[in-house]
């Protein structure tokens, strides 16, 4: 089951998955001036069995020099500022990324790949947050988010992280509280099952990775 929405956005923070659950899909996107080959895959798919997971399909890009690449025909309803990547980070492989059963590692880059990666996450996926350069973390709880299934709908838990500028003197500037999360309620108050596949194993894994999750600066 794909997660309906993307992981929450935290001001001045990026997120990264350490491993991708089977069923995750990655768009085959090409950088400007290149396009997916006609017969090429639209997506890579994390698939596997109990002992081994890997990415199916290969992304391939070819030059689109012969094509007219200026394609917008009407103004977008509201021009978007350049997208800051969150789930679409440049590929990087933490040194001590564990081989989690039922998970794929970060796929290797392909030739002329776009600078941002677009993932479609599945229920049970966990992502980890870190403040961008120049901001420091004020933790109120786990700096991670998990895609859960509740009452037949998917939702991401709210990471308990605030990123504040180095020069800020106030501990919680501007009353920037993370939005209330259903995590605050005891499970007994909800009448339906909450699916959190692999939550325990990934939480344990997070502790060992804390220092190596964000070894690469993102632009």
């Amino acid at each position: 089951e794909l997660c309906d929405d993307d992981p929450p956005e935290i001001p001045h923070a990026t997120f990264k998955a350490m491993a991708y659950k089977e069923g995750t899909m990655l768009n085959c996107e090409c950088k400007r001036g290149f396009r997916r080959i006609k017969s090429g895959s639209l997506y890579m798919l994390c698939t596997g069995n109990s002992s081994h997971s890997s990415w199916d399909n290969q992304c391939q890009c070819t030059s689109s020099a012969t094509r007219n690449t200026t394609k917008q025909v009407t103004p977008q309803p509201e021009e978007q500022k350049e997208r800051k990547t969150t789930e679409m980070q440049s590929p990087m492989q933490p040194v001590d990324q564990a081989s989690l059963p039922g998970h794929c590692r970060e796929p290797p880059p392909w030739e002329n790949e776009a600078t941002e990666r677009i993932y479609h996450f599945v229920v049970g996926q966990m992502v980890y947050y870190q403040c961008v350069q120049g901001y420091r973390a004020l933790h109120r709880g786990p700096a991670e988010s998990v895609c859960k299934m509740t009452h037949g709908k998917t939702r991401w838990t709210q990471p308990q992280l605030i990123c504040t500028g180095e020069m800020e003197t106030s501990q919680f500037p501007g009353e920037e509280k993370p939005q209330a999360s259903p995590e605050g309620r005891p499970e007994s108050e909800t009448s339906c099952l909450v699916t959190t596949t692999d939550f325990q194993i990934q939480t344990e894994m997070a502790a060992t990775m804390e220092t190596s999750i964000f070894t690469t600066e993102y632009q």
């Epitope: 993307d6 899909m25 768009n27 396009r35 639209l42 917008q72 309803p77 350049e82 997208r83």
Partner: nanobody, 126 residues
Framework: EVQLVESGGGLVQAGGSLRLSCAAS????????MAWFRQAPGKEREFVAA????????RYAGSVKGRFTISRDNAGNTGFLQMNSLRPEDTAVYYC???????????????????WGQGTQVTVSS
Amino acid sequence: EVQLVESGGGLVQAGGSLRLSCAASGITFNDHTMAWFRQAPGKEREFVAARDWSDIITRYAGSVKGRFTISRDNAGNTGFLQMNSLRPEDTAVYYCAAREGGVVAGVRSGAPYDYWGQGTQVTVSS
């Protein structure tokens, strides 16, 4: 010249239904991902739903899942958004969009879409 033309918008009471259409010319929908976005007055554009031509991935915003259905008629070069159980907060201008790559969804997902329609107004009264 590429054109995406939306239709089917209008005024409807809460709980009612509307079916939006998006007719494409100048491109073929059978090799494009099709999406719907919406923008309410004073708010940012919001992703609603997207579906690729191979039907590998269909994505919905959590706020509309279970109420809205995106579909497409590749032969007729038309996309649809069936909207049921409409709420006042669904009031917005709805835009059809298309791109050559796979589905892009989420908060700032509009940027990668290559083609845009002019929009159709949907107003849900309480």
